[in-house]
Each structure stands twice: as structure tokens, then as C-alpha cells.
Interface confidence: medium
């Protein structure tokens, strides 16, 4: 390819209630003949980095943000890269970045706010 | 295809500032994407300095931090680099990258010698 | 910050062999947050080998990456004359992100 993976998440902020799940949408459009073996996808914190929740090597390499994240395995495959954050808490607010790598890479910032 | 290249004065005095500029081509700098500085001392391996994100967020390393500045500016699509009270310790050469985590591409470099 | 130690400094070896480099970390990371580099001399480094295993756009399949934990190695499985350089890793599992010293590959 010669262009950059485009990453799509939405222009507005999640807004989520303290205690209750939040799914951080994000998307990319597979190629003809994507497998999930060539997937890289990293869900991180945009100001620092912090990895939040990630896939490689054709499988879920887990949260490690406070165990409380989950992707939509099933939906991989198709395109579907959202991020699902259980029992919301105020710390949680800010900016998350999805991060996704085939051969080529995109990412793209959605802003979670906490009521 | 993005493309970066470095450009600003290769030599620069003792106690002075190092200032660089990243050209970039093919692309858009409002991109989601950290750009970032790396140096690499003569004969020597390579150090990160810093990046910034189009919001204007930015992370430098802790070793420069007191001495660093970058700055974007999104309407020229480039990015630069200042780093004041420069010693013979800061020559090198001074590469400018795009990278949210790993470095790709590169620019080609540019040496900065700090000498009077 | 998370410190890179690559051995060995210098390997010597012949076209054909099989290079194996390795790249130890002072704490444990995450495998997606590792990536390999090539440098030749007077040349900007170039992106191999990220998230530990998989190989950047455009690069031959001799290169393969592995590893885990704190231990991870960059494998070329048949030198040809171009291979012959310098090879850093690098992390980015926290800031600052940082490199390691580097391995020389060099023609016996």
C-alpha cells in the first residue's frame, strides 16, 4: 500500500457516567485478503503513551489498564477496532488513541468525558 | 508517501541555540501522528529528544527537557526543534521522524557542530 | 527509564550465515512495544522489525523478529552483502523512548 492505514473513530466525545461500560469506537477498512495475524492494534493513552489494551500475533494480548478493557474479537476481522471500558471511573476522562498496523500504520484520537 | 527533511544552520557557538526545522512532504503533519527528534553523537548510538502531536502536546526526554522546545506549524507542515545552551556534547547529527511509537520514515539528517 | 542491552557489540560472519541478535530490557514489555532498526553508515536508520515480530513494508523475509518479556532477538537467516551494518532496538513502552547501544554486523 502506499498510503496510511485510515483509522476512523468518531469527531465527538464518548460520554459515559461514572460506574457504567463505555465503547471507544474505532474502524479501518481491511484490505482483500486481510488475516488478523497481520493486525497490530494498540490502544494507548494519547498524552503519554500508555498502553491501554493491544492485539498482535493473530491474538488478544489483554488489557493492561487496570483490567477493565475488552476489544470485539469477533468483530476484528471486519474492520471493527472499538474498545470496550468497563465501570467508568472520573480518572478515566481524557483522550485515547487507537493505533492500528497492517503493513502500513494509522491511528486517530477519541476523547472520552466523564459525567 | 511522507517524507521529512531536516534544514537549519550546521554549525552553531558554544552556549548558543540549536535551532532545526522538518520539512514534510506527502502528507499532512495534522495527522494523527507524534513527529519527533532523534540525535545520534558521532560514532555513537542514537537518543530520542522529543516529539509533538498536532494539538501542540509534547513529550520530551527528561535528560533535555530543561533545554528543549518543539513547536508545529501546521499551515507550512513542519515541525522544529530548539535546544539553548548548547555544548561541544551536542554535536551530532539530528534526525527528524514520524512515529506514534516506532521511528517511519526518517529524514535524511543533518550534523549540527557546536563550536566557536 | 527502561535501558536496552544489545549483544553481542560486534558480530563477525560471513554472507550466508545466520546472524541472531539480541536485545535484553531493565524492565519487562509488552512485545508490541519493541522494534528493530538498520543503519548504514552515513544513512538514517530504517525501520525492520515492529510490535517484536513483524516486518516494516518492504522487507525481505530473512529478517524475522522474537521475543518477550525482557529478551527479544532480531534473526537474519542468510547474510547477503547488503545486511552488513548496524542494528538497534528501541522501545516504546514508556517514555523516554529509548534505543539500545547497538550491534555491529560486520564481514569476517
Known amino acids: 500500500p502506499t498510503g496510511a492505514v485510515e483509522v476512523q473513530v468518531p469527531e465527538d466525545p464518548v460520554v459515559a457516567l461514572v460506574g457504567t461500560d463505555a465503547t471507544l469506537r474505532c474502524s479501518f477498512s481491511p484490505e482483500p485478503g486481510f488475516s488478523l495475524a497481520q493486525l497490530n492494534l494498540i490502544w494507548q493513552l494519547t498524552d503519554t503513551k500508555q498502553l491501554v489494551h493491544s492485539f498482535t500475533e493473530g491474538r488478544d494480548q489483554g488489557s493492561a489498564y487496570a483490567n477493565r478493557t475488552a476489544l470485539f474479537p469477533d468483530l476484528l476481522a471486519q474492520g471493527n477496532a472499538s474498545l470496550r471500558l468497563q465501570r467508568v471511573r472520573v480518572a478515566d476522562e481524557g483522550s485515547f488513541t487507537c493505533f492500528v498496523s497492517i503493513r502500513d500504520f494509522g491511528s486517530a484520537a477519541v476523547s472520552l468525558q466523564v459525567a | 508517501q511522507v517524507q521529512l527533511q531536516e534544514s537549519g544552520p550546521g554549525l552553531v557557538k558554544p552556549s548558543g541555540t540549536l535551532s532545526l526545522t522538518c520539512a514534510v512532504s506527502?502528507?499532512?503533519?495534522?495527522?494523527?501522528?507524534?513527529w519527533n527528534w532523534v540525535r545520534q553523537s558521532p560514532g555513537k548510538g542514537l537518543e530520542w529528544i522529543g516529539e509533538?502531536?498536532?494539538?501542540?502536546?509534547?513529550n520530551y526526554s527528561p535528560s533535555l527537557k530543561s533545554r528543549v522546545t518543539i513547536s508545529i506549524d501546521k499551515s507550512k507542515n513542519q515541525f522544529s526543534l530548539k535546544l539553548n545552551s548548547v555544548t561541544a556534547a551536542d554535536t551530532a547529527v539530528y534526525y527528524c521522524?514520524?512515529?506514534?511509537?516506532?521511528?517511519?520514515?526518517w529524514g535524511q539528517g543533518t550534523l549540527v557542530t557546536v563550536s566557536s | 527509564e527502561i535501558v536496552l542491552t544489545q549483544s553481542p557489540g560486534t558480530l563477525s560472519l560471513s554472507p550466508g550465515e545466520r546472524a541472531t541478535l539480541s536485545c535484553r530490557t531493565s524492565?519487562?514489555?509488552?512485545?508490541?512495544?519493541l522494534a528493530w532498526y538498520q543503519q548504514k553508515p552515513g544513512q538514517a536508520p530504517r525501520l525492520l522489525i515492529y510490535?517484536?515480530?513483524s516486518r516494516a513494508t518492504g522487507i525481505p523475509d530473512r529478517f524475522s523478529g522474537s521475543g518477550s518479556g525482557t529478551d527479544f532477538t532480531l534473526s537474519i537467516s542468510r547474510l547477503e552483502p547488503e545486511d552488513f551494518a548496524v542494528y538497534y532496538c528501541?522501545?516504546?513502552?514508556?517514555?523516554?523512548?529509548?534505543f539500545g547501544q547497538g550491534t555491529k554486523v560486520e564481514i569476517k
Open positions: 521522524a514520524r512515529g506514534w511509537n516506532w521511528f517511519d520514515p
Open positions: 506527502g502528507g499532512s503533519i495534522s495527522t494523527s501522528n507524534y
Open positions: 509533538i502531536y498536532p494539538t501542540g502536546n509534547t
Open positions: 524492565q519487562s514489555i509488552n512485545g508490541i512495544l
Open positions: 510490535g517484536a515480530s
Open positions: 528501541q522501545q516504546y513502552g514508556s517514555s523516554p523512548r529509548t
